[in-house]
Each structure stands twice: as C-alpha cells, then as structure tokens.
C-alpha cells in the first residue's frame, strides 16, 4: 500500500533517500574497520504527511489518529523499506577480513 | 542487534507498545467496516535515545550521525518490529465478509 509519492510540502521536503558522508571516526568504527575510510551513508529523511508513501494499513491508521490526537499519537516516520548490503574490510585477531552487512544502507524509504 | 532495553529517560518514556482506543469514525472506516465498532490499536510510541532498542546497524549509524549533525540527521524512530493480525467484518457488494489484515496492529517495537 505505497500511497501517493507527491509531496504536498514542496520538492524534497517529504520522506526520501538522502546521502550523508561520514568518516570512520564519525561512525565510531575507526578501531575495527580499515576500509572504506569514508562511507556514503544512505538514509531516509523527511516528513510523512497524510498518506505519503504509507507503508501499510498501520501507517494509514497512524495518520488518522495523529490528526485526531496529535499530542498522543505521533505522525508516521520516514524509515527504510529495504536495504543495500555494504562490504567492510574489518580488522580481526588474525589480520583482516571482508564482512558484508545487509542492514546498513537504506535503499528505499517509506512512512510507518 | 536489539540493543539496550533500559530507558535512560525514565519509565515509559522510551519506544514501546501503547494501546489507543479508536472508533470506526476515528479511523475513517465507518463506511466499509461493520465490526468491531471500536478498535484497540496497538502502536509504537516513545523516544529512541542512543542505542535503545536499535533494530540494526542502520539504527546505530543513525544515532551516531544524529549526535554529530542533529539538524541534518533525525534520531531513530519508534516503529513496529512485527505485527499482530486483525480480523474485520467488512461490508461487500453481496453482503459481508471476514477479512484478515496482517499489518494493522503493532506487536513489538524497535528504533530505526
């Protein structure tokens, strides 16, 4: 139930994929990751106005109840719908190894 | 990677399951749902402080980058980790039918 992809708040204001550049130091990884030295972190950022990219029925309910009880029920939130794997070269006790993380980089976003 | 379940903000302030009572009118369902007349909607509400119920590596990264760039990167968000199905009695062209929705009621929460 991926509802409307038209953002009523103006271009780029609603939930979408953004790329944030981060160093190993920024991420707190400098002591266990060798490479890459800099990571292009893709993440989901932006507002979730009524029915925009609603992930499911729960998101639609949340929108309705947020409208009625904004102090109790928060608006839906922009989160990853899927991920791209990322490969890191990690330090190990015996040297280095490649490690793949499936849940590190957002690939697609929705509101929930 | 479901990190700490201890809420540093005080009891009940962090991401957890809440129940919100809603009528069919509240949900905008009165024209297509016969029963139940009132729904106990379980949803995920609360703050996601550093590493609290972090769903995965992405959530951990988000926490680190939010600390560094709070105006650019939002904090992780409290969303369902899983759902409970819910059965509705719906109006149809020919009468009524039972319909099960798998993604309506939050069962468990995490931060992402």
């Amino acid at each position: 139930a991926r509802n409307g992809d038209h953002c009523p708040l103006g271009p780029g204001r609603c939930c979408r994929l953004h790329t944030v550049r981060a160093s190993l130091e920024d991420l707190g990884w400098a002591d266990w990751v060798l490479s890459p030295r800099e990571v292009q972190v893709t993440m989901c950022i932006g507002a979730c106005p009524s029915q925009f990219r609603a992930a499911n029925m729960h998101a639609q309910i949340k929108t309705s109840l947020h409208r009625l009880k904004p102090d109790t029920v928060p608006a839906p939130c922009c989160v990853p719908a899927s991920y791209n794997p990322m490969v890191l070269i990690q330090k190990t006790d015996t040297g280095v190894s490649l490690q793949t993380y499936d849940d590190l980089l957002a690939k697609d976003c929705h509101c929930i | 990677a479901r990190n700490g379940d201890h809420c540093p903000l005080g009891p009940g302030r962090c991401c957890r399951l809440h129940t919100v009572r809603a009528s069919l009118e509240d949900l905008g369902w009165a024209d297509w749902v016969l029963s139940p007349r009132e729904v106990q909607v379980t949803m995920c509400i609360g703050a996601c402080p550093s590493q609290f119920r972090a769903a995965n590596m992405h959530a951990q990264i988000k926490t680190s980058l939010h600390r560094l760039k709070p105006d650019t990167v939002p904090a992780p968000c409290c969303v369902p980790a899983s759902y409970n199905p819910m059965v509705l009695i719906q109006k149809t062209d020919t009468g009524v039918s039972l319909q099960t929705y798998d993604d309506l009621l939050a069962k468990d929460c995490h931060c992402i």
Partner: nanobody, 121 residues
C-alpha cells in the same frame, strides 16, 4: 560502455575446484579494484573477495579464506577467482564488480551478469 563478463561456473562435486574469470571491456581493469560477490538462493549479496588496483592487496570473507584465491592479469584485462575445496554452501550466482578501491560495493560502477556455481554430489 563499461562491461564485465563472468564465466567458468558450473556443477562441481564437494571438494572440487573451479576457476571463475571476469573479463572487462570498455575500460582498463588495472586502474580498478575488482570484487567478487555471490548470491545464494534466498539470500542477499555477500562480498567474497577483493583485489586492489594499487598494490594488489587481497581480501577475503572468513567463509572462503584459505580456499579461494583472487588474482588478476592486467595484460588480459581479466580477473580470476580460483575456488578450491568447494562446499555445498558455496552454491550461488557469482558476480564480479569493479570500483576505485577495495572493498568494492554493490553500488559500484561496473557489474557483471553473473555465473552460476552449483556444488552438489
């Protein structure tokens, strides 16, 4: 355009060997790091090995260390993955990819179409 083509896959018995090749066209391979990925049935992509462009440093996933060897022949614009002591869990589609440095990522600039490796008795 930039293109990579893998070959050398097939059906092999447990304990057997295969050598996969990755031929580049449209660009010179020696300017790039080469990575091998695999995708087992119902699983996500996994980085298996990588060889850097500069000093030819090599990197391996723990699951293949000591059994797989990555190499390159810049004169032939080709990279290789020698796979020995194959196990049923190595069954997957194997892809090569090229990028500026190791570790090569899923979002890299050039990506092959894959070659199937099946390890079964």
């Amino acid at each position: 355009q930039l293109q990579l083509v893998e070959s050398g896959g097939g059906l092999v018995q447990p304990g057997g060997s295969l050598r996969l090749s990755c031929v580049a066209s449209g660009f010179t391979l020696d300017d790039y790091a080469i990575g091998w990925f695999r995708q087992a049935p119902g699983k996500g992509l996994e980085g298996v090995s990588c060889i850097s462009s500069s000093d030819e440093s090599t990197y391996y996933a723990d699951s293949v260390k000591g059994r797989f060897t990555i190499s390159r022949d810049n004169a032939k614009n080709t990279a290789y993955l020698q796979m020995n002591s194959l196990k049923p869990e190595d069954t997957a589609i194997y892809y090569c990819a090229a990028d500026t440095e190791c570790p090569v990522q899923v979002t890299s600039m050039a990506w092959g179409q894959g070659t199937q490796v099946t390890v079964s008795s």
